[in-house]
């Protein structure tokens, strides 16, 4: 008789999840010699230990602490780029501007980027059929708790001027319910962070509005100011030109507004 399995509303664990995590760990430590001390098998064991045999709606930050410890990494605290709803451009930017880091440029972020995972209570099986959806099922699921944990730690580590890339094409340019709005904003440390600088990325080619005046940006400014952190905002009207100018800052067309 087949055993009854909980059906969740979200997609199941990414296929070949264990192999993917291990391979990504090896690749990351290859590219980043300063992380060569990391034992990737131990990293996988700690990752697995955070959610295997546990109810996928009852995961805590504590479950991820062994993994957090193994993945401890020092990034330059004044070179942090946060993002919200515009991951691809943020990653393209840090691939060019190699001295800046998104969360996914760190080991733990790199391991989990775009992956889904969950287990089942009291069995050592990984659930490849379905995993809890944050809205429809529960917020304390393995994926959500992981990102909340690493995002909090990443924001806590930031100092000086912190940059955030925001999607100007969305109805809520700043969304209080995003990871940035609900976790990172509230974990920037006022005693270390002087300024949060928002880069609002425009979508339309002829969009010349000042999106820094958007009500949601004003809301972000209010939240940040109340935390004794200065706020500044820049419109990035031409993201394609913006990236090109990061690659070739000497280009004559890069002196004008982008």
């Amino acid at each position: 008789v087949p055993r009854w399995r909980q059906q969740w509303s979200g997609p199941g664990t990414t296929k070949r999840f264990p192999e993917t995590v291990l391979a990504r760990c090896v690749k990351y430590t290859e590219i980043h010699p300063e992380m060569r001390h990391v034992d990737c098998q131990s990293v996988w064991d700690a990752f697995k230990g955070a959610f295997i045999s546990k109810h996928p709606c009852n995961i805590t930050e504590e479950d991820y602490q062994p993994l957090m410890k193994l993945g401890t990494q020092t990034v330059p605290c004044n070179k942090i780029l946060l993002w919200s709803r515009i991951k691809d451009l943020a990653h393209q930017f840090t691939q060019v501007q190699r001295d800046m880091f998104t969360l996914e440029d760190t080991l733990l972020g790199y391991l989990a980027d775009d992956l889904t995972w969950c287990g089942e209570f009291n069995t050592s099986k990984i659930n490849y059929q379905s995993c809890p959806d944050w809205r429809k099922d529960c917020s304390n699921n393995p994926v959500s708790v992981f990102w909340k944990t690493v995002s909090r730690r990443f924001a806590e580590a930031a100092c000086d001027v912190v940059h955030v890339m925001l999607n100007g094409s969305r109805s809520k340019i700043f969304d209080k319910n995003s990871t940035f709005g609900s976790v990172e904003v509230h974990n920037l440390q006022p005693e270390k962070v002087q300024t949060l600088e928002a880069w609002v990325i425009h979508g339309g080619r002829e969009d010349s509005r000042d999106l820094c005046q958007d009500p949601t940006i004003k809301e972000l400014e209010s939240i940040i100011s109340k935390r004794n952190i200065q706020f500044s905002c820049k419109n990035i009207y031409r993201p394609d030109k913006f990236l090109q100018c990061v690659k070739n800052p000497e280009d004559s067309s890069c002196t004008s507004e982008i």
Partner: antibody
Amino acid sequence: VEESGGRLVTPGTPLTLTCTVSGFSLSNYDMTWVRQAPGRGLEWIGVISSGDNTNYARWAKGRFTISKTSSTTVDLKITSPTTEDTATYFCARILYNKGRYYFTFWGPGTLVTVSS
Amino acid sequence: AQVLTQTPSSVSAAVGGTVTINCQSSQSIANSDELAWYQQKPGQPPKLLIYDASTLAPGVPSRFSGSGSGTQFTLTISGVQSDDAATYYCQGTVYDSGWYAAFGGGTEVVVK
């Protein structure tokens, strides 16, 4: 870069070698230990990073411990020497800050002889 | 078993001649190019000659050159001088349940 502490020891007697550096800070550079048995080739033992993380050759795990004892000294402890550990032990700095495993600024080496 | 195999184990060359030393890895080297070459003379520590497979270390004469990637690497000494008599080692970073540095067995260069 200069190693010290090499001497004649009996098998099983722990021995600590010290590497003393000047002109750069151990908080900025990784340091490595390499050994060479008489008339033999070079053998990598392990590395300690600027952030005090260690990485060892598989054969060296449990047999050696690398640690920083000050801002200018790195120790290599041979936990339980055997006659196979008879060698000249070299300490060297990694070429670049947070860099790949390339070894420059070598010390002259210190000779360890393990014999009963 | 040696992960990095150097050939030949010994080579003789006349002053002004060319020496080629090969280094083969049984597994792929980190980033395909994470390989160095060292020169060691009797009673002295090794000296870094080349890193990243082909980049000359500071102060190293241009008669030394390196090439290769992946698993096959070569050190070439063009216009050999008597001062080049030494043992040469390749050293790469390889993965086997963890990253580690591995040295080749060495090649003795005798200058006639």
